[in-house]
């Protein structure tokens, strides 16, 4: 059986302030069961950006319908980007449990924010 892969295809994404940024992520298998979460930064100080299961993330939406059967696309769109959103974003797969256990992280996508064209 193939090892689970978390694919973040782009190394970097550049977006003008005020626009939306799409951060792509797909997983190679639906097994094991468990959620995907998005973080900015790595390590213990990382910031949770999106958790499909719970929480309120008003500027973040899933690109694909997360309720679709066999969905393996966990890309997100962040609206109204500001310079404060710059950083490296990681798509992380967890195994369902109490608590959920982190299994694998994507390679990361660096988001840079350009000044809004005048």
């Amino acid at each position: 059986e193939e090892e689970l892969q978390v694919i973040q295809p782009e190394k970097s994404v550049s977006v003008a302030a005020g626009d939306s940024a799409t951060l792509n992520c797909t997983v190679s298998s639906l097994i094991p069961v468990g959620p995907i979460q998005w973080f900015r930064g790595a390590g213990p100080g990382r910031e949770l950006i999106y958790n499909l299961k719970e929480g309120h993330f008003p500027r973040v939406t899933a690109v694909s319908d997360p309720t679709k059967r066999n969905n393996m696309d966990f890309s997100i769109r962040i609206s109204n980007i500001t310079p404060a959103d710059a950083g490296t974003y990681y798509c992380v797969k967890f195994r369902k449990g109490s608590p959920d256990v982190e299994l694998k992280s994507g390679a990361g996508t660096e988001l840079s924010v350009r000044a809004k064209p005048s």
């Epitope: 892969q5 694919i7 973040q8 295809p9 782009e10 190394k11 970097s12 792509n24 797909t26 997983v27 190679s28 066999n70 393996m72 994507g106 390679a107 990361g108 996508t109």
Partner: antibody
Amino acid sequence: DVQLVESGGGVVRPGESLRLSCEASGFTFRNYYMTWVRQAPGEGLEWVSTISDTGDTAYYADSVKGRFTISRDNSKNSLYLQMNSLRADDTAIYYCAKSWIWWTFFDYWGLGTLVTVSS
Amino acid sequence: ALTQPASVSANLGGTVEITCSGGNSNHYGWYQQKSPGSAPVTLIYADTNRPSNIPSRFSGSTSGSTTTLTITGVQAEDEAVYYCGGSSTGDGIFGAGTTLTVL
């Protein structure tokens, strides 16, 4: 066994249209993104267009945007490429490819169909 | 854009590495075309995955911005053009191709 069979190629004049088809078998067609890739004589591979599993999202290379339309019929396990306003530089072998979970990776290819645009 | 050498050569039974670098991709694939106009064959997708019909002498690895296709125990039938492919949509997806000559 995965099989992809293209058809619809031929010789046309500049400005004319052509519709390519790709019939898929050996996998659950509706679950996968599908792609057209072309190869001009003596040149390398060039990505042309990709369509999502449900058919609601399409991606195009700049060179064909506005002229080509990709579509699919999941009930017929078929992929299509409608090519309008054809130009001489569209002359190529057009391959149908099955995309893996991320659409810029391809795991299976068809044998291709030749499109020649010449006056 | 993805950059790969135009040509490489290898001795029959030897080992050859073909590299590809650049672009905005985190992941890569490799495709083989034995003659112009013949159907490409996927050797490697997403860095290391090999389709079930591909011999184990083909392997892929990625480090940073460089991906490498390694052919161990090169055979005469491996003479072909090898294209790398990137995961980023902005990369044009394919490199220009590397011709492998078997000596």
